[in-house]
């Protein structure tokens, strides 16, 4: 009986569309599959980034696979047939590997490329983003930023820099409909007539970068000769209540008392009479429910609470 | 493709202590929040501890508050629970969990193979 | 805390039948809630986020429905593959988990 052989799938490629690091590896059936007719062939794809300790492996029907990569690298992909062991009366046949790599040839030396990117998404409605010109550049480099997440066409440039010394230095984007909770992919690259700049691309995903708006509305509650119960109110905009975490500071007669993470608008505090006064701050942060990480907002105005009547209701300034 | 591997995990004495690690490959480990998920033998999943990517946010379950520690070294790719004070109902496999994050939701889109503690003297 | 309630807790039925489980939350959780399958020896795995919404690679015969306190999970037509206990999860506050639904073959 004859051994069982399949070749490997034709023409493996990956395809780069212009998004910024969202390629596409795609193949062609194996030549030879007359034999197999009545079966489903399989193909079991791997790929990673050039350096990655980890292959991704996906096993698929289609001709086709979609992901991002790290154009800072350069990417290999492997791709193989398989026959199910239905198809062959016994155990699962495989092809040999077709291999294939992609990179985009670098330009300038790496400290060309701009220095300390920062992303921030204000308050889940402005995305801003800033960074250093590279090391030993020229007053006449300037740096381009472009930027695609699924959804748009095509990538889009910057076209609200922010600038010093009349170079780019930062973008302010424009309103980024339906944005969150995918990849959102940056390059930025420059020109300079002194040298060739180095690019640099960026993945990220905004639900994770943003930074609210403090707390308003500080208020202080009497519960009992030795409660006080701290309150505030959400920030303003679009971020639901039930994805904030705090952080409250309080200092009693200028002493920093408590220091306390909580995730709702209230805190209670037990007091003393000897109080004399009592003040805090708040600041808010997405929390794990709606994304996997946050940046702390700034610290909310002070609210303060004076005076020797502690029996008061409701304290508010 | 996504792994997520604990150890740690055996028997220990009641009010002893215990370390359990989660080594995670195949995805950027410092893009995740992650989190502990246990179950007790023949019974149902109970959530224990969460921690956002960065390390800097953490959560935890009443029932382990104050004994547990979360803690990840995104450097190794790796989540920790410190667990002290063990109590016999703490008796249970325990999962590493990836979140994965839709409109303002979460849910746990793969998890580890488990590791077994067992509290008894 | 949420309390996540399933019912029935356990359930048998057969190859090609269609089984329907519900979870009841404590108080309203929107459209917060997930469905997991368990095998025997094995971690869950994610069937259906944010109360309808299937997980990429999981069977269409899948569904989930509801909102507010009640939920569903249907198996269209059970496959063998299928036996397994299932567990509802909600994610309004904390992390709950209903105790979970044994489904056997009849």
């Known amino acids: 009986d004859t051994e069982i052989k399949v070749n490997p799938p034709q023409d493996f490629e990956i395809v780069d569309p212009g998004y910024l690091g969202y390629l596409y590896l795609q193949w062609q059936p194996p030549l030879s599959l007359d034999h197999f007719k009545e079966c489903t062939v399989e193909y079991e794809l791997k790929y990673r980034n050039i350096g990655s300790e980890t292959w991704k492996t996906i096993i698929t029907k289609n001709l086709h696979y979609k992901d991002g990569f790290d154009l800072n690298k350069g990417i290999e992909a492997k791709i193989h047939t398989l026959l199910p062991w239905q198809c062959t009366n016994g155990s699962e046949v495989q092809s040999s590997w077709a291999e294939t790599t992609y990179w985009i040839s670098p330009q300038g030396i790496p400290e060309t490329k701009v220095q300390d990117m920062d992303c921030v998404y204000y308050n889940w409605q402005y995305l801003l983003c800033s960074w250093k010109p590279g090391i030993g550049v020229l007053l006449d480099t300037n740096y381009n930023l472009f930027y695609w997440y699924e959804g748009l066409d095509h990538a889009l440039q910057c076209v609200d820099y922010i600038k010093a010394d009349g170079q780019n230095i930062g973008c302010r984007f424009p309103y980024l409909e339906a944005s969150d909770y995918k990849d959102f992919y940056i390059c930025v690259n420059g020109s300079s007539e002194n040298k060739p700049i180095r690019s640099s691309y960026f993945t990220f995903q905004l639900q994770n970068i943003v930074k609210p708006l403090p707390p308003v509305y500080l208020t202080f509650t009497r519960e009992s000769s030795c409660e006080i119960k701290l309150k505030w109110s959400i920030p303003l905009g679009p971020i639901p209540a039930r994805c904030f975490d705090y952080e409250i500071e309080i200092r009693e007669d200028d002493t920093t008392l408590v220091t306390a993470t909580v995730e709702n608008e209230t805190y209670t505090l037990k007091t003393t009479n000897e109080t004399r006064q009592l003040c805090f701050v708040v600041r808010s942060k997405v929390n794990i429910y709606c994304s996997d990480d946050g940046i702390w907002s700034e610290w909310s105005d002070k609210q303060c609470w004076e005076g020797e009547d502690l029996s008061k209701k409701t304290l508010l300034r | 493709e996504v792994q997520l591997l604990e150890s740690g995990g055996g028997l220990v004495q009641p009010g002893g202590s215990l370390r359990l690690s989660c080594a995670a490959s195949g995805f950027t480990f410092s893009s995740y929040a992650m989190s502990w998920v246990r179950q007790a033998p023949g019974k149902g999943l109970e959530w224990v501890s969460a921690i956002s990517g960065s390390g800097g946010s953490t959560y935890y379950a009443d029932s382990v508050k104050g004994r547990f520690t979360i803690s990840r070294d995104n450097s190794k790719n790796t989540l920790y629970l410190q667990m002290n004070s063990l109590r016999a109902e703490d008796t249970a496999v325990y999962y590493c969990?990836?979140?994965?994050?839709?409109?303002?939701?979460?849910?746990?889109?793969?998890w580890g193979q488990g590791t077994l503690v067992t509290v008894s003297s | 805390d949420i309390q996540m309630t399933q019912s029935p807790s356990s359930l048998s039925a057969s190859v090609g039948d269609r089984v329907t489980i519900t979870c009841r939350a404590s108080q309203s959780i929107s459209s917060y809630l997930n469905w997991y399958q368990q095998k025997p020896g094995k971690a869950p795995k994610l069937l259906i986020y944010?109360?309808?919404s299937l997980q990429s690679g999981v069977p269409s015969r899948f569904s989930g429905s509801g909102s507010g306190t009640d939920f569903t999970l249907t198996i269209s037509s059970l496959q063998p593959e299928d036996f397994a206990t299932y567990y509802c999860q909600q994610d309004y506050y904390l992390f709950t988990f209903g105790q979970g639904t044994k489904l056997e073959i009849k």
């Open positions: 944010a109360a309808s």
């Open positions: 969990a990836r979140y994965g994050h839709y409109a303002y939701g979460s849910y746990f889109d793969y």
